[in-house]
């Protein structure tokens, strides 16, 4: 912790200026008034304080605002944001997208994923929902950050906003997040024609149920293997060999490359070897001919 000393009269600070660069940590602690610092936060980022000095300034703000900083201070944190922990950020109430932009810019190139995720979460809470302006800001200033939001937060996205989301914004989304986003995307793109619909819905398909994947297989979409590999395991397992062949079209040959990887491996184990052989890809591991498949899960559910 910072040692407490009294401020020498000649070092008293009346404004936040560049001379503070040459204040030792104990002098900053003793001589900088926290209220003055908060009022002149906009000056701090123009001064190349070291990380040690920023620690002292953060300590001052923490003492002044134990319940969390006001947005007027947050907006001007600049490089001081790099000193914030997710726990600090959880105390904030942020509604301004200008504040979000400023802090996203500062965090670029630094290992700040947890802090950024918490910040975005606070913005969504502060604004009440994940509106189009927020999504536009995230896609412009922090590609991939949309996926840092919890499924609960993503559930506040109105379907009308889904169109602003680009494929690369969903690259890091997990299954639970896509489960939330997919129905919204389906609703948002429902009036589009077959091929246009597929292009739009493709990045969200990691959240699609079996019946929707089956429906796509009837539309000659020629799904690429990368998209197929991102489908939910539960959505792929019930598909027949014929359905997968129709779904992938010319890309079906890629199954051989992926036969050891989920969900392809799991799907192969559920198919009759005879059916797999019709693909002519040499896929192995299907159910041998003459074997009876018992679905024990049904019996377990009844007992």
């Amino acid at each position: 912790d910072v040692e407490r000393t009294t401020c020498p009269p000649e070092k008293e600070v009346h404004e936040i200026d560049e001379s503070l660069i040459f204040y030792k940590k104990r002098e900053l602690e003793a001589c900088v008034d926290a209220a003055l610092l908060a009022a002149q936060m906009d000056r701090v980022d123009a001064i190349p304080f070291t990380y040690e000095q920023l620690d002292v300034l953060k300590h001052k703000l923490d003492e002044l605002y134990p319940q969390g900083y006001p947005e007027s201070v947050i907006r001007h944190l600049g490089h001081l944001f790099l000193k914030m922990s997710p726990e600090d950020i959880r105390k904030w109430n942020v509604t301004s997208l200008e504040t979000l932009k400023a802090l996203l810019k500062v965090s670029k190139g630094h290992e700040m994923s947890a802090q950024v995720a918490t910040l975005i979460d606070r913005v969504v809470v502060g604004r009440g929902q994940l509106d189009k302006d927020t999504v536009d800001t995230l896609t412009a200033f922090c590609p991939g950050c949309l996926c840092s939001l919890s499924p609960e937060r993503l559930s506040s996205v109105p379907p009308s906003v889904i169109g602003a989301v680009r494929p690369q914004d969903l690259d890091t989304c997990g299954p639970r997040q896509l489960d939330v986003l997919y129905p919204k995307a389906r609703l948002a793109f429902q009036n589009m024609s077959g091929s246009e619909y597929f292009v739009k819905i493709r990045p969200f398909l990691g959240g699609a149920p079996t019946e929707d994947v089956k429906a796509l297989s009837q539309q000659n979409v020629s799904m690429d293997l990368a998209t197929f590999m991102k489908l939910r395991r539960e959505a792929v397992l019930p598909l027949t060999v014929a359905e997968v062949q129709k779904l992938l079209g010319p890309h079906v040959e890629g199954l051989k490359v992926e036969e050891q990887h989920s969900p392809v491996r799991d799907w192969i184990l559920k198919q009759r070897q005879d059916d797999l052989d019709t693909l002519g890809l040499g896929l192995q591991g299907g159910i041998p001919n003459g074997y009876l498949i018992l679905d024990l899960s049904v019996r377990e559910a009844l007992s």
């Epitope: 000649e10 070092k11 200026d17 560049e18 001379s19 660069i21 040459f22 204040y23 030792k24 940590k25 190349p48 304080f49 070291t50 990380y51 040690e52 000095q53 490089h79 790099l82």
Partner: antibody
Framework: QVQLQQSGAELVRPGTSVKVSCKAS????????IEWVKQRPGQGLEWIGV????????KYNEKFKGKATLTADKSSSTAYMQLSSLTSEDSAVYFC???????????WGQGTLVTVSA | DIVMTQSHKFMSTSVGDRVSITCKAS??????VAWYQRKPGQSPKLLIY???TRHTGVPDRFTGSGSGTDYTLTISYMQAEDLALYYC?????????FGGGTKLEIK
């Protein structure tokens, strides 16, 4: 003890660029700022700019914006100053100095003589 | 930019003398003034900062004083090894600026 070791003298052609290095030892490089200063023969000292090796943040004298570019490599504890579009006016000794323990220009490198000549 | 003026380019002195070198800032620099010593063929060395704080290892015959715009470096008892060029500098705001220097010579 704190030491700043600068690269050797350079003879360069007008219009080209040169990169001067300043290797710090004896302290935590990222904890303190590195300043750069110019001294032309028979003239005074001129502050060029400062870099925060921890964050990479820089601040320049307006006079040297576009002329000098300051960088730092944390892994080798070395600060660099690149001077571009060199003219005879850039012929000078260039010093780096560390604001060690927050004391201004507390320790200086030995200086690097840059001579711009056709 | 803040201009730092050292009115004496040269000062004659003898060993044992008390010597005062002055420096004037073009505006109030709130005691953010440093003094450096430079000997021929060497880099500058920090002597004093914040107008009166002696840097580590600097002999106590060197003292600094002043406030506002007027600052002084005093050598209480001149030694032969103190013959050098002395610069003042303001570290109050960028661009940091130096005085033109005062050279101490033997009478």
């Amino acid at each position: 003890q704190v030491q700043l070791q600068q690269s050797g003298a350079e003879l360069v052609r007008p219009g080209t660029s040169v990169k001067v290095s300043c290797k710090a030892s004896g302290y935590a490089f990222t904890n303190y700022l590195i300043e750069w200063v110019k001294q032309r023969p028979g003239q005074g000292l001129e502050w060029i700019g400062v870099i925060n090796p921890g964050s990479g943040g820089t601040k320049y004298n307006e006079k040297f914006k576009g002329k000098a570019t300051l960088t730092a490599d944390k892994s080798s504890s070395t600060a660099y100053m690149q001077l571009s579009s060199l003219t005879s006016e850039d012929s000078a000794v260039y010093f780096c100095a560390s604001d060690y323990d927050y004391d201004p220009f507390a320790y200086w490198g030995q200086g690097t003589l840059v001579t711009v000549s056709a | 930019d803040i201009v730092m003026t050292q009115s004496h380019k040269f000062m004659s002195t003898s060993v044992g003398d008390r010597v005062s070198i002055t420096c004037k800032a073009s505006q109030d620099v709130s005691t953010a003034v440093a003094w450096y010593q430079r000997k021929p063929g060497q880099s500058p060395k920090l002597l004093i900062y914040w107008a009166s704080t002696r840097h580590t290892g600097v002999p106590d015959r060197f003292t600094g004083s002043g406030s506002g715009t007027d600052y002084t470096l005093t050598i209480s008892y001149m030694q032969a090894e103190d013959l050098a060029l002395y610069y003042c500098q303001q570290h109050y705001s960028t661009p940091y600026t130096f005085g033109g220097g005062t050279k101490l010579e033997i009478k």
